[in-house]
């Protein structure tokens, strides 16, 4: 078939058709990608939105069940997805977990152990107690 | 909170230049299309040009009427949209509005507007 | 470019009473259509986008239908503040249009 493309007027001739390109004139939204059709135009989409136009948000949370990790509760929004995490959790997808020894008060000298929404003092010798503050009377 | 605000309006002659400003706030501004819509006292909306967004280069768009007198820019670092207007005509009297093409090919956002004069 | 065409021009309504504006557009838009509400000395507001879709903060009783090149947009019990001029908007394609406006006024 004849196909020719005359850049001046966007001009193209398909067979005996006219066929004038529809892209300078888009309306393709939230990132969509024109692409030409006849005598219209289409949007590619990003991943997170969909739609002629790209207007319509994508529903991570439904298509991705397992988008949260560690029993965080999913938020769809706009143009994207959120993970609220339960304690002890963090990251995007509540993957990461929290260093609770960051904010530990383990008395120095003992080790801090970092458990999930909790951390426990592993205590020297001579120390006790939760946070190895206290003397170890069977040392004394 | 969303807002739009133009200023740079005012009474020019007839071949006469201004350049409007629309200072906006409360989203990222390259990441929205932006539009210019402007209204003669007592008339409808007229849409007269648009300035698309960062993930589609920031192209531009114009209506006939103003096509090579008016050009569309934006200052992303100044989150400010402006137009540009030479070889003013009266029929260009109106009250100018920058709004926000909200990404459901829709204006969800105007500013105040600011009333352009063009008289001698 | 694609016409909107817009009717009534006006209407004069009481509070309580049913408003039906029409759009037709001269081309399919794909409900690519919004509807706007504007009152004396303000900025346009939108009410209605995608044809249907109300728009966050917008009362319930303003509602949009319509596809291809017909679209509505009704408003089931007028209310006061309700008396303003209204335009519908193709999105589908630059350069974008407006319809005439329908100006709703007291009885």
């Known amino acids: 078939a004849h196909h020719h493309h005359h850049h001046g007027e966007n001009l193209y001739f398909q067979g005996s058709e006219r066929n004038i390109d529809d892209c300078p004139n888009h309306r393709c939204q939230n990132g969509g990608v024109c692409v030409d059709g006849v005598n219209t135009y289409n949007c590619r989409c990003p991943p997170q939105w969909t739609g002629q136009f790209c207007t319509e948000d994508v529903d991570e949370c439904l298509l991705q069940p397992n988008a949260c990790q560690n029993g965080g509760t999913c938020a769809n929004r706009n143009g994207g997805y959120g993970c609220v995490c339960v304690n002890g959790w963090s990251g995007d997808d509540c993957s990461e977990n929290i260093d609770d020894c960051a904010f530990a008060s383990c008395t120095p000298g003992s080790t801090c152990i970092d458990r999930v929404a909790s951390f426990s003092c592993m205590c020297p010798e001579g120390k006790a107690g939760l946070l190895c503050h206290l003397d170890d009377a069977g040392n004394s | 909170e969303v807002q739009l605000v133009e200023s740079g309006g005012g009474l020019v002659q007839p071949g006469g230049s201004l350049k409007l400003s629309c200072a906006v706030s409360?989203?990222?501004?390259?990441?929205?299309?932006m539009e210019w819509v402007r209204q003669a006292s007592g008339k409808g909306l007229e849409w007269v040009a648009a300035?698309?967004?960062?993930?589609?280069?920031?192209?531009?768009v114009y209506s006939a009427s103003v096509k090579d007198r008016f050009t569309i820019s934006r200052d992303d670092s100044k989150s400010t949209l402006y137009l540009q207007m030479n070889s003013l005509k009266t029929e260009d009297t109106a009250v100018y509005y920058c709004?926000?093409?909200?990404?459901?090919?829709?204006?969800?956002?105007w500013g105040q507007g600011t009333l352009v004069t063009v008289s001698s | 470019d694609i016409q909107m065409t817009q009717s009534p021009s006006s209407v004069s309504a009481s509070v309580g009473d049913r408003v039906t504006i029409t759009c037709q557009t001269s081309?399919?838009?794909?409900?690519?259509l919004a509807w706007y509400q504007q009152k004396p000395g303000k900025s346009p507001k939108l009410l209605i986008y995608?044809?249907?879709r109300l728009q966050d903060g917008v009362p319930s009783r303003f509602s949009g239908s319509g596809s291809g090149t017909d679209y509505t947009l009704t408003i089931s019990s007028l209310q006061p503040e309700d008396f303003a001029t209204y335009y519908c908007?193709?999105?589908?394609?630059?350069?974008?249009?407006f319809g005439g406006g329908t100006k709703v006024e007291i009885k």
């Open positions: 409360g989203f990222t501004f390259s990441d929205f299309y």
């Open positions: 300035q698309r967004n960062k993930a589609n280069d920031f192209s531009i």
């Open positions: 081309e399919d838009i794909y409900s690519g």
């Open positions: 995608g044809a249907s």
């Open positions: 908007q193709q999105g589908f394609k630059y350069p974008l249009t």
């Open positions: 709004s926000r093409d909200g990404g459901r090919l829709a204006l969800d956002a």
